[in-house]
Each structure stands twice: as C-alpha cells, then as structure tokens.
C-alpha cells in the first residue's frame, strides 16, 4: 500500500514523492534500500533528499532500485517505499508501455490532457506538447497551465501525447518528459436530468383494501448507454429495505427500455394485501443520474366500492 512505482529517463530530472504523507514540519529520511545507505540532503549531490521529495538531477540508469522514506514525527514513524526505474532513452519514436502514465479519455466537450507528475517540479510555462513525437501546431491545440486543450476533438486525435518541460533547481535546468495515451469517447449518446414519466407528481392512486397494488416508477435519462442511472422507491423518505414492512417490496433489478431512442428505467413497487395504514404513507419515486435527482410523490386513496344501486 505504501509503495509507489516511479520511472524516468536517463539524463532527465526525476522527482519522487514519499508515499507516506506527513506535515511539512516532520522530518523525512531517505535510504537506498539495497544498502540501507542514507541519501544525502546536500543539494550539491546529483541524487539528494529534500523533505518528502527525492530528487535525481539528472537521473542515471544505475539509480534504479527501491528507496525507503521514513516520516518522523514526535509520536510516530511512518515508512514508505519508492520503486524507481530509470530507462535508457529510446532512439526511435515509440514510447514503450512501461514509460506510459495513465490513459485519459476526452470528448468533443472535454479534451484536457494533464501533464503527469508536473506538480512535483519547479517549472515555468509554456509546456511543449508532442503527439506521436510530432510537435503540436495549429490553433486547435492550446497549452494552458499544466494541461493541453484540444478544440473540436475528433477520433484522429487519439494517440500518445508527450509533455516536455524544464525543471529549475538552483539556477540549473533539467529536461523532463512524460507521456500518456489519449482516447476519444464517442459522444453520440448523451445524458440529461432525469425525466420521470410515471407516476405524475402528487398523483393519487386508488387501491382496494385487502387487494394487491403495484406502483411503477419510470424515468428516462438520455440517449445511449447510461453509466450512472437509477430509479427507486422510498417510503416516508426511507429506503424500502430500511422501512421494514415485508408486505411492501421493490422489484429486484431495474428494467431498462428505450423510448424514442432515450434510455429509460422502471422499478415496480409491490404492495401485498393493502392495509388502511398504507394510505397514510408517502411514496416517493426517485430517478437519479450523474446530473441530478428528481422525485415524484404518490399517495394512495381507498377506491370507492362501485355503487350498484340506480
């Protein structure tokens, strides 16, 4: 849990943060695990410790190994491990998988690519950005603070993006590069605030005492697959499972359907052997997704027996 993988390229700066966090006032000691040798704090060394940070200025392949950091406070010590691997620079353009940071995905509306690990470094704008080793040019690409914005994203924008910046340490400059993949999400689908189709808000449903009754909560959430969407029933503001009335049960699972291309869900509430006290309850149909939550309230009323007299 308290071990972290870090990697870099030879002759570039690499800064690693101790996986164990502490207050800035706590002292942090760093050791090279294989030899248990203490890492110096003097900045004249190529590899030195600076509080929670371990700095390789610049890094060498031989620096690879496991480093131990111990966060010391007056009341406890916490130990973390940094597994550092320094790789030789590739002669060709290909960036191997082991040098890749996490993949990010974007869409027409949201296309930010953050430069990985940049917050650890002392850098100044602007960043340089490359896609598949080609410098990015054109008005569609905007380097903004620590991220790249791509306007009007297209599927062809998918690929490996490298950010390059200069780390400054006591007047000396060191180059840093970091690469991550960018994928483009198909935005044919969309989601919107839930729209409850049934029941109507403040609907009064007629039921017969002693008979069974069903209430259906049905809502639509947008077009295409909806990743976060749910419909559910509540009784007097409480989950059905917490309400503790075995006669009143929610159908297991939600039925998905498509109406006019919209993704919809419905959930049936089954009331067995309707009793007088059920008429006093407030039944809330809730529809929620990543945008928001809507609720429609239903109350039950006794269905009048049919009058057969003329």
């Amino acid at each position: 849990k308290f071990s972290k993988q870090s990697w870099g390229l030879e002759n570039e700066a690499l800064i690693v943060r101790c996986p164990r966090q502490g207050k800035p006032s706590y002292t942090v000691d760093w050791y090279y695990s294989q030899t248990n040798k203490s890492i110096p704090t003097q900045e004249r060394n190529r590899v030195f410790a600076s509080g929670q940070l371990l700095k390789f200025l610049p890094a060498a392949v031989a620096d690879s190994g496991i480093y131990t950091c111990i966060v010391r406070s007056p009341t406890f010590n916490r130990t973390g491990y940094a597994n550092v691997t320094i790789y030789k620079k590739q002669s060709d353009c290909n960036v191997p998988d082991y040098l890749m940071y996490s993949t990010v995905s974007g869409s027409e509306k949201n296309s930010k690519i953050y430069c990985p690990t940049i917050d650890l470094y002392n850098w100044t704008a602007p960043l340089e950005w490359f896609k598949n080793c080609q410098a990015l040019q054109g008005s569609r690409y905007r380097a903004h603070k620590s991220f790249l914005v791509i306007d009007n994203v297209m599927t062809e924008d998918a690929g490996d993006y490298t950010c390059k910046f200069i780390h400054n340490e006591n007047g000396a400059n060191y180059s840093v590069t970091a690469t991550r993949s960018f994928t483009v999400k198909d935005e044919q689908g969309f989601s919107l605030f839930p729209v409850i189709g049934a029941p109507a808000q403040n609907e009064i449903k007629e039921v017969e005492i002693g008979k069974n009754a069903n209430l259906t909560c049905s809502a639509c959430f947008g077009k295409g697959t909806q990743f976060l969407a749910a419909v559910l029933w509540q009784l007097n503001g409480t989950k059905i499972t917490d309400f503790g009335e075995p006669r009143i049960q929610q159908e297991e699972g939600q039925n998905q359907s498509f109406s006019n291309g919209l993704a919809c869900l419905d959930m049936v509430l089954r009331i067995a052997d309707v009793k007088e006290e059920d008429l006093l309850l407030q039944y809330d149909c809730l529809a929620l997704n990543l945008h928001g939550l809507r609720r429609h309230t239903v109350r039950l009323s006794r269905k009048n027996p049919i009058d057969h007299h003329s």
Epitope: F193, L232, G237, L286, N289, L290, H291, L293, R295
Partner: antibody
C-alpha cells in the same frame, strides 16, 4: 420533515478558503442530491454546483470550477462546500438546498464575509 | 449557458390585485422551469415546479404557465404575505440559472 441546518457565519481574509457545512435530517441522505446556491448582498441567486451522494458525482458551474469543492459525508448526513482563493466579491449568503435541479427545501443560509 | 430574463424587475401592487411576472429563456427549456419566493433574510421557497405544478403546501392563488421559452407566474389575488422577491430558474440543463428576480412591493 426535511431539514437542512448550515454552519454559522464566517469572516475570511482575501486569498483564504471557507468550508460551509449543511447537515440534513428527516430522510435518507444517500438518495438526495444537494445543491449549493449563493446570493451576494442585494443580488440574485447563483447556482454553484451540486452533489449526488449515492453516485459520488459532482457538478460545478463553470464559473466556480477549480475554486469550489463539494463533498458529502453519508455517515453524518452532511454536505460541504469549500470555496478557495476568496475575494471580496465572494461575500454572500451561501445556501444548500435539497435536490438538483428542483431545489425543494433550503438551509437557513451561511453568511461569508471576505474582508481584509 | 441558458440565460433567464425576468420582467419586470420590480412592481407595486395592492392587496387583492392580480399580479403577473414573466420569465424568458434564451433557448427552449420545454417545461423545465421553477418559481421561487424569497422574503428578506430568508431562504428561497419553491412555489411552482415543471412550469405549472404547484408545490405541496403552496396556496392555490399561485399558478404557473408556459413552455419552450416564455413562462408566467400569476398571483390571482395578492395577499399581505406575498410581498417578496420572486425568481424563476431553469431546470433543463447545467449550469442551473436563475432570473434576476422580481420584487413585489406594496403600493
């Protein structure tokens, strides 16, 4: 039945942060959504963002993106709104409200004054 | 963002008057419009949701109408407790936006 109780008034210096809490009672908090709305003195209402605790998803108004953080603690049925890099124009009453987008019931409001 | 324009920004009326406030959206929002009432020093209170549905506990003298871009809040017979500021809010898409408010004052 549903009640939202907010934390007390705050006086803050420019550049600092403020964290306002909103404790909910009278319902199942996990199946709520909480919106945050502010109102500067003598001005109208401005939606800042909202959270759906069941999914852990948050929506922010673009204007506040990067400066506001909305969180929720289901164990205490409390929602929080933290606004950073405060400036004098952030002086306002901050409200939490139940549900999003239809704000059915509201907290009493928390006055945040930003002054040097 | 969807802009909401309310008019008038203020009006003076007497108890018993019929009062109409209008709200216009910068694009169609179907029937996704809410009306709120706010009294000085108090939090807003939801009156009407989905353009025309009366929120539970709200007096029937309040009514809402409209769809698409043009909406109306009507108070059929103004009561002393109705003197307040009224806001419309679109509930169609984020960011949620409010109208600038209409202050209803005693004539």
């Amino acid at each position: 039945q549903v009640q939202l109780v907010q934390s007390g008034a705050e006086v803050k210096k420019p550049g600092s942060s403020v964290k306002v809490s909103c404790k909910a009672s009278g319902g199942s908090f996990s199946s709520w959504a909480i919106s945050w709305v502010r109102q500067a003195p003598g001005q109208g209402l401005e939606w800042m963002g909202g959270i759906i605790p069941l999914f852990g998803t948050v929506n922010y108004a673009q204007k506040f993106q990067g400066r506001v953080t909305i969180t929720a603690d289901e164990s205490t049925s409390t929602a929080y709104m933290e606004l950073s890099s405060l400036r004098s124009e952030d002086t306002a009453v901050y409200y939490c409200a139940r549900d999003l987008p239809d704000m059915v019931s509201w907290g009493q409001g928390t006055l945040v004054t930003v002054s040097s | 963002d969807i802009q909401m324009t309310q008019s008038p920004s203020s009006l003076s009326a007497s108890v018993g008057d019929r009062v109409t406030i209008t709200c216009r959206a910068s694009q169609s929002i179907s029937s996704y419009l809410n009306w709120y009432q706010q009294k000085p020093g108090k939090a807003p209170k939801l009156l009407i949701y989905a353009a025309s549905s009366l929120q539970s506990g709200v007096p029937s003298r309040f009514s809402g109408s409209g769809s698409g871009t043009d909406f109306t809040l009507t108070i059929s017979s103004l009561q002393p407790e109705d003197f307040a500021t009224y806001y419309c809010q679109q509930s169609y898409s984020t960011p949620l936006t409010f109208g600038g408010g209409t202050k209803v004052e005693i004539k």
